[in-house]
């Protein structure tokens, strides 16, 4: 049989951020290669990453076709140099991945504060609307395009001289907050999808502070 020195893949894990989606698995191959297949629950299997010695496969192109679908992948193991060999049951060894629904499970990438502008005692903070690899009509959609009002941002802001973090929330990419005149503030934002139960929050954006080049100050 061609399976004597072929082992099935294990620890199949989806790694996905802002819909960039990679399936990873173990073990590192010794005298074997892998092919990955992916399908929706009701769809046909599509093969990817043919006869690879990698232990990962980028499945982004497949999942972005419909991010609200639930996907299943499987990893086939073949003896190196003899990929026609099959197991004793007439099939190569394979292992199934957990199910994966991109819209519900992709991690939210670290957001970026695009700009902030102070006018008197108001500050407008704008979050960059990150581009994803999801396409519609040949155009790449932004995170806001994909998630709509399901996506909110939490702004943490604090006086440079203090530690307590005030919060504000928006379901757009802009905040308008009240600040004390003559005080410098720092900002950090976090993306949140409240309707989720897991992967609800992104990591925090890098901190941006007033008095640095990203912002603009206008005295009225």
């Amino acid at each position: 049989s061609g399976t004597t020195n072929t082992v099935a893949a294990y620890n199949l894990t989806w790694k996905s951020t802002n819909f960039k989606t990679i399936l990873e698995w173990e073990p590192k191959p010794v005298n074997q290669v892998y092919t990955v297949q992916i399908s929706t629950k009701s769809g046909d299997w599509k093969s990817k990453c043919f006869y690879t010695t990698d232990t990962e496969c980028d499945l982004t192109d497949e999942i972005v076709k419909d991010v609200k679908q639930t996907y299943l992948a499987r990893v086939f193991s073949y003896p190196a140099g003899n990929v026609e060999s099959t197991g004793s049951a007439g099939e190569p060894l394979y292992e199934n991945s957990p199910e994966f629904t991109p819209y519900l499970e992709t991690n939210l990438g670290q957001p970026t504060i695009q700009s902030f502008e102070q006018v008197g005692t108001k500050v407008n903070v704008t979050v960059e609307d990150e581009r994803t690899l999801v396409r519609r009509n040949n155009t790449f959609l932004s995170l806001r395009d994909v998630f709509g009002k399901d996506l909110i941002y939490t702004l943490y802001y604090w006086k440079s001289s203090s530690s307590g973090k005030k919060t504000a929330k928006t379901n757009t990419n802009e905040f308008l907050i009240d600040v004390d005149k003559g005080e410098n503030y720092c900002f950090s934002v976090q993306a949140v999808i409240p309707s989720r139960t897991v992967n609800r929050k992104s990591t925090d954006s890098p901190v941006e502070c007033m008095g640095q080049e990203k912002g603009e100050f206008r005295e009225i």
């Epitope: 909110i152 973090k165 309707s195 929050k201």
Partner: antibody, heavy 120, light 107 residues
């Protein structure tokens, strides 16, 4: 089932310290925010402070700033309220509550509360 | 800090009565107002969020509305289990603040 259980309350002398715990089950605290709210006997609700367990960010009411510290241990799925330099006016039932984190819903689940009495 | 002024502080009503409690914010809080019910010795329970949305599992006799910075909690037909204290809270800005509470008692 989402549940929050406070513990650690009791009688303490003025100037003393106490640490309250808020053990969460049915959800992971780092995905949400945890607030502490207190209620003096026969009085209304007073917000104490919050923590985002994902990053440790906190904010406190002026009445407790510098004396109280909120922390969280995500591995234990538990938030804490460390209370130092306690005063008679800190006597209250202390509740922890979960902040759902949306624009709309705020404190959707509350613990049963734990009584802190500051008296000599 | 934003003040939430709640009125009345207490009221007496009978089963079947329509009850209205109001809360006035000291500045604009958009719709970021919640209403809670608290019974003696128990934790508060969320009733209304975002000024007018009924929280899951809350009876439809409870409703909320907003007019500018004025917020209203209405119980259309008071039931025996509704005798409790009600609090409004704004969460538009940090720190979030509560109204002083309204105790609804049996007439």
């Amino acid at each position: 089932e989402v549940q929050l259980v406070e513990s650690g309350g009791g009688l303490v002398q003025p100037g003393g310290s106490l640490r309250l715990s808020c053990a969460a089950s049915g959800f992971t605290i780092h995905e949400y925010w945890i607030h502490w709210v207190r209620q003096a006997p026969g009085k209304g609700l007073e917000w104490v402070g919050y923590i985002d367990p994902a990053n440790g960010f906190t904010y406190y009411a002026d009445s407790v700033k510098g004396r109280f510290t909120i922390s969280a241990d995500t591995s234990k799925n538990t938030a804490y309220l460390q209370m130092n330099s306690l005063r008679a006016e800190d006597t209250a039932v202390y509740y922890c509550a979960r902040d759902y984190g949306s624009l709309q819903v705020f404190l959707d689940y509350w613990g049963q509360g734990t009584l802190v009495t500051v008296s000599s | 800090d934003i003040q939430m002024t709640q009125s009345p502080s207490s009221l007496s009503a009978s089963v079947g009565d329509r009850v209205t409690i109001t809360c006035r914010a000291s500045q604009d809080v958009n719709t970021a107002v919640a209403w809670y019910q608290q019974k003696p010795g128990k934790a508060p329970k969320l009733l209304i969020y975002s000024a007018s949305f009924l929280y899951s599992g809350v009876p439809s006799r409870f409703s909320g509305s907003r007019s500018g910075t004025d917020f209203t909690l209405t119980i259309s037909s008071l039931q025996p289990e509704d005798f409790a204290t009600y609090y409004c809270q704004q969460h538009y800005t940090t720190p979030p603040t509560f109204g002083q509470g309204t105790k609804v008692e049996i007439k």
